[in-house]
Interface confidence: medium
């Protein structure tokens, strides 16, 4: 069976017809390239006025307009609110109340793309395997990203959140126009991978939502981790606006001027520092969500009666903090080279600023408890690394659940650990599951691409798969078309319950209070330490191009300030970030 | 690198004050505790107080209470330790000595102050 | 306060030899460093939470213990290791042991 034209909000749309065999039977309809809205340049979105005729939706778009990996140029357009959409089919009626899953891209909120890292038109983000393996429909969508996507003044001239209303405006036009492909717009599951999952978490918790999603997956991010939320947009609005010569002193006269400028200029007018800086390299993402009052009414950890009826499940990789720690302290990945207690001190630090010296003291301490039992550079590198994943994904991920199980009335809860370890051959032996390490499995491409992968790759694909379609179709991970190698039980705040997802799952992957002692660190000792109060006003980043960075503007609200990027860094971006 | 110099020797009269400097340089000043040790002739070590250098907050030891003072110039990365009321007993070398990392030991030493309290 | 006693108050070895100096916590502390000092010269670090070596100090010095008891041991004396060494506790108000002073026998 096969949809043919499609009529939607905005006119008819035609995909392609794939058959899954050459013997016939099974297909998948996929459409790629359908509008679902228009956005002006730092402007809100605005629904898609439509088309004549029939659109023939067989090819990606452009991805919206991006820094390239080496920050030096620029690629794809403004013109990027497209979607595109996988619906499995079966031999003789074409499907129909279908659940559905929308993904959300990660990419630090700078870059990425619906369809993801292409090789040999092989795409990262292909629906295919998801949706044919789990009788769902997969949407994905393109979002802006970087300046054009969340540059804000912390006021109404220029609000910010823009990529964040590009993501509603999908999720609200799937609502409306997936019956038509077969889905249940009843049945919406919205599911991401680190700022993507961010995105997903900050999406359940905004009022615009409401009555719109169903559940929700959150790979490797949070609304509450501390990359999420810019506690300065002026700041960043001021270090883009002097860039490309628009004022600075009235925020409705730089919005204007910001506005008519060149968003090519705009793009480029930012760079993330991939260099080992002062901070922690997180610390200097710029163009990310804002609490505007209006969209993100107030800080997230105050929001979570809004998910009181959507299933939840959240997760993270076992050493998600790898790719970070390369960067902030490059020793980790090199054999020949050492990590020093410095070099973590100065770490440490940079993410506890709020509380000052008696933070970063008890943070190192408790970190570094076993190096005096166990003073290998193997031990050094690996706490460097379980530092970063607990910082910037499994702290804020542990309070997310709690929040999420505390305030939940239909809502039920999951957590997991994905522990399957990294396949780059140039990691250290005793690498584990890196961030975005997961993205492959849960994408099938053990079963897309089965001759770069082992069998335990595909087993681990083919687990992922099925606990996350299950939960889509029925909010059980355990309940579904799909067969699961075991059960997984909810999440409760007494036991703090979660899968552990590796090559074996069997009934002793169902594990408990994952890093409790770290965690009641962070959730008390350290939460108690008074917060220090920055000596310096907000300063603006150096006229010239050298190297000397200023001093982050100093905010008590947050937990650690953001730092001004440096133009002189040039360096190339890690190709697999997928934060 | 790192590096901690200390203002020059004092004779000081039973009585008085003594106000001894530590100039830190070679590391973010505010980032690590800064403590002062003394030794006086052929004894042991005695820990007197610290600093935060960032804020300005101190603990002192009981033994010294009352009597030390210790405070810091940000502008200058330099802590002070004055010691009032100074008795005979109170000759020694006064050491300033930053913290390793974290809350560990004193990894970073001044090179010492000598305080002779003669009348 | 924590009290730190220190044995021997002095010893005398050789070049070469195996030399132990213990240090007694009242009461137990979970971590102790120990420091080098040599006359008219500030004190050094040598070994800290209780078993860890700064970079530049020699893989001869190690350490050990937990609780009450705590050791220092020079697996092979040197010349330059000939100086007197303190305990030391760290808590919110630290304090040392009275210390160890190495001659040449």
């Known amino acids: 069976a096969k949809l043919g034209a499609v009529y939607t909000e905005g006119g008819f749309v035609e995909g392609v017809n794939k058959k899954l065999s050459l013997l016939g039977g099974d297909s998948v309809d996929i459409f790629k390239g359908i509008p679902f809205a228009t956005a002006k340049t730092l402007e809100n979105p605005q629904r898609h006025p439509g088309w004549q005729g029939t659109l023939k939706a067989t090819n990606f778009k452009k991805r919206c307009l991006q820094a390239t990996i080496t920050q030096d140029n620029t690629y794809g357009q403004e013109d990027c609110l497209y979607l595109n959409i996988w619906v499995p089919q079966g031999r003789k009626q074409v499907s129909h109340n279908l659940p559905v899953m929308v993904w959300i891209y990660g990419g630090a909120f700078l870059m990425g793309s619906g369809q993801g890292a292409n090789f040999l038109k092989n795409y990262l983000y292909d629906g295919e395997e998801i949706a044919t393996r789990g009788n769902v429909i997969v949407v994905t969508f393109n979002y802006r990203v970087g300046p054009l996507g969340f540059l804000s003044t912390g006021d109404a001239n220029l609000p910010g959140n823009f990529g964040l209303r590009d993501q509603h405006m999908a999720i609200a036009w799937v609502k409306r126009n997936i019956a038509a492909f077969g889905g249940d717009p009843d049945n919406i599951t919205i599911f991401g991978e680190s700022a993507g999952a961010a995105s997903v978490s900050l999406q359940t918790l905004s009022p615009y939502n409401k009555g719109l999603i169903r559940r929700a997956i959150s790979q490797s991010g949070m609304a509450l981790s501390p990359w999420a939320i810019q506690k300065n947009p002026l700041f960043w609005a001021k270090t883009i606006a002097k860039k490309v010569g628009c004022p600075t002193e009235d925020t409705g006269k730089m919005a204007a001027c910001l506005k008519i400028t060149d968003p090519r200029a705009l793009t480029l007018a930012y760079k993330l520092p991939v260099k080992k800086q002062e901070y922690p390299v997180v610390h200097y993402l710029a163009f990310i969500p804002v609490i505007d009052g209006d969209f993100i009414p107030d800080d997230p950890i105050n929001l979570y009666n809004n998910t009181a009826d959507i299933d939840y499940i959240a997760g993270i990789n076992n050493m998600d903090g790898h790719l970070f720690a390369t960067i902030d302290v490059p020793a980790v990945d090199k054999t020949k080279q050492t990590v020093t207690e410095e070099d973590f001190y100065r770490l440490v630090s940079g993410h506890t600023v709020a509380k000052g010296l008696k933070g970063a003291q008890a943070t190192f301490d408790i970190y570094t408890e076993s190096w005096a039992q166990d003073p290998s550079q193997e031990n050094m590198k690996k706490t460097v690394v379980a530092f970063e994943t607990d910082v910037l994904f499994l702290i804020p991920t542990e309070i997310a659940l709690a929040q999420h199980k505390a305030h939940a009335k239909s809502a039920k809860t999951y957590s997991y650990l994905f522990s399957h370890p990294s396949r780059m051959p140039i990691y250290p032996k005793w690498m584990g599951a890196d961030h975005a390490d997961d993205l492959q499995y849960v994408f099938g491409k053990p079963f897309a691409t089965p001759l770069g992968y082992r069998p335990q790759d595909r087993a681990v694909s083919k687990a992922m798969i099925a606990y996350w379609t299950n939960f889509a179709r029925s909010g059980d991970p355990n309940m579904g078309n799909s067969p699961v190698p075991t059960h997984w039980y909810p999440y409760t705040l007494e036991n703090g319950n979660y899968l552990d997802i590796t090559k074996t799952i069997t009934s002793a992957s169902m594990k408990e209070h994952l890093r409790e002692k770290f965690l009641k660190f962070w959730a008390v000792t350290f939460e108690v330490l008074p917060t220090v109060t920055g000596d310096q006003d907000t300063l603006t980043p150096p006229e010239d191009d050298s190297e000397v960075a200023p001093d982050p503007p100093s905010d008590d609200s947050q937990v650690v300030p953001v730092p001004p990027t440096d133009d002189s860094v040039e360096a190339q971006m890690p190709a697999t970030i997928g934060f | 690198q790192v590096q901690l110099v200390q203002s020059g020797a004092e004779v000081k009269k039973p009585g008085a004050s003594v106000k001894v400097s530590c100039k830190a340089s070679?590391?973010?000043?505010?980032?690590?505790?800064m403590h002062w040790v003394r030794q006086a002739p052929g004894q042991g070590l005695e820990w007197m107080g610290v600093?935060?250098?960032?804020?300005?907050?101190?603990s002192y030891a009981q033994k010294f209470k009352g009597r030390v003072t210790m405070t810091r110039d940000t502008s200058t990365s330099t802590v002070y330790m004055e010691l009032s009321s100074l008795r005979s007993e109170d000759t020694a070398v006064y050491y300033c000595?930053?913290?390793?990392?974290?809350?560990?030991?004193?990894?970073?030493w001044g090179q010492g102050t000598l305080v002779t309290v003669s009348s | 306060d924590i009290q730190m006693t220190q044995s021997p108050s002095s010893l005398s070895a050789s070049v070469g030899d195996r030399v132990t100096i213990t240090c007694r916590a009242s009461p137990s502390i979970s971590y102790l460093n120990w420091y080098q000092q040599k006359p008219g010269k500030a004190p050094k670090l040598l070994i800290y939470a209780t078993s860890r070596l700064p970079s530049g100090v020699p893989s001869r010095f190690s350490g050990s213990g937990s609780g009450t008891d705590f050791t220092l041991t020079i697996s092979s004396l040197q010349p330059e290791d000939f100086a007197t060494y303190y305990c030391q506790q760290r808590s919110s108000s630290p304090t040392f042991g009275q210390g160890t002073k190495l001659e040449i026998k």
């Open positions: 600093i935060n250098p960032g804020d300005g907050a101190t």
């Open positions: 000595a930053r913290d390793y990392y974290g809350s560990s030991p004193l990894g970073y």
């Open positions: 070679g590391y973010t000043f505010t980032s690590y505790n």
